[in-house]
Amino acid sequence: FGISGRHSITVTTVASAGNIGEDGILSCTFEPDIKLSDIVIQWLKEGVLGLVHEFKEGKDELSEQDEMFRGRTAVFADQVIVGNASLRLKNVQLTDAGTYKCYIITSKGKGNANLEYKTGAFSMPEVNVDYNASSETLRCEAPRWFPQPTVVWASQVDQGANFSEVSNTSFELNSENVTMKVVSVLYNVTINNTYSCMIENDIAKATGDIKVTESEIKRRSHLQLLNSKA
């Protein structure tokens, strides 16, 4: 099954994560070739018999694509000539997780690299003051997470404090029966302090900060994918 008389070319991939229901990117680059028609890109997945995607002679070749990927893949055709073989995966499914191989053939030779792709759900948390509560309370909400994350509260003033006794976290299954809405409530909040709601699973870590003063409320949030250089 091997090509005879060809040299090896360098192919580089980056481990990444996909957000269920959204589009994802599987990153792959290679030593470019001067002629687009000489470049063949094949994406394969461990456990899947057919191809995930094939690009050859300057266009997508979807004839041998496995059923589970039909209609969901594309390469960045205009960037192939400069060595970008990254794959766009539409409507990421939980089952898309696994080991992928980016396999490249050019006039210079052939090469391949594996990529670990994780799938789950992750979203930015939003922290608000809960004015309906009897005492000063903060409410941290994030619409979509999977697998079930951990939620930890922290405070700038009381660094290292354990807020588990004064917080309550619930997970509510969303309508598609996979992802969950995360709601965490922190009680006995003091004014002139910055609180952080940190949500984390094995795919992503997200933080929502809120600074409450007498005159204003400032919010900030950020999300970071874990085990990924992307």
Epitope: S4, Q42, L44, K45, E46, G50, L62, S63, E64, E67
Partner: antibody
Framework: QVQLVQSGAEVKKPGSSVKVSCKAS????????IHWVRQAPGQGLEWMGG????????KYAQNFQGRVTITADESTSTAYMELSSLRSEDTAVYYC?????????WGQGTTVTVSS | DIVMTQSPDSLAVSLGERATINCKSS????????????LAWYQQKPGQPPKLLIY???TRGSGVPDRFSGSGSGTDFTLTISSLQAEDVATYFC?????????FGQGTKVEIK
């Protein structure tokens, strides 16, 4: 020009196993699927399963699940099909074939006879 | 599983005459994004492996004479031999490769009348 060359005919006892090889020659590469199809005497074609050699990913027909094992050795460009717990109904010609817009290249076939 | 049904089971045609074989699938083999039907036709002569004649329901395989043609879409397909030659005596099979398990029709034996 790609060629698939299969191992020779086998005579086996009921309950035993048979392993048929299929060697690829010519300018092909690892990302073609190799499938196995059998044909009992005077009967039609029956798909048994296939393999993607680059990952060793396999898929089997329900009828053969648990009895058939398809493997591939990239270093020798050879695919193998092993069928266990043989019975007389397994007497057939076994073909390997490359999947490419259907099955465009076939091995010459290996006759397996199961007889006590 | 997709069931493939061929008709007739056997066919006797005079040399130079047209032979027509039908194949019906239990579900559509048309994949709209590429507008192709995942159907192939094979010819098998006694003691030989099958030979790919037609793929994508209507594209002739390498070195296949142009008297062989395939047509149809969705669930109904036809293989036509426009002018039967002596060397065309064989059994013909249709096959779907739209999804696994890959399935074949039961075969149609073509003989000379």
């Amino acid at each position: 020009q790609v060629q698939l060359v299969q191992s020779g005919a086998e005579v086996k006892k009921p309950g035993s196993s048979v392993k048929v090889s299929c060697k690829a020659s010519g300018d092909t590469f690892t990302t073609y699927q190799i499938h196995w199809v059998r044909q009992a005497p005077g009967q039609g074609l029956e798909w048994m399963g296939g393999i993607m050699p680059i990952f060793g990913t396999t898929k089997y027909a329900q009828n053969f699940q648990g009895r058939v094992t398809i493997t591939a050795d990239e270093s020798t460009s050879t695919a193998y099909m092993e069928l266990s717990s043989l019975r007389s109904e397994d007497t057939a010609v076994y073909y390997c074939a490359r999947r490419n817009y259907g099955m465009d290249v076939w091995g010459q076939g290996t006759t397996v006879t199961v007889s006590s | 599983d997709i069931v493939m049904t061929q008709s007739p089971d056997s066919l006797a045609v005079s040399l130079g005459e047209r032979a027509t074989i039908n194949c019906k699938s239990s579900q559509s083999l048309l994949y709209r994004p590429v507008n192709k039907n995942f159907l192939a036709w094979y010819q098998q002569k006694p003691g030989q492996p099958p030979k790919l004649l037609i793929y994508w329901a209507s594209t002739r395989g390498s070195g296949v004479p142009d008297r062989f043609s395939g047509s149809g879409s969705g669930t109904d397909f036809t293989l036509t031999i426009s002018s039967l030659q002596a060397e065309d005596v064989a059994t013909y099979f249709c096959q779907q490769y739209y999804s696994t398990p890959i399935t074949f029709g039961q075969g149609t034996k073509v003989e000379i009348k």
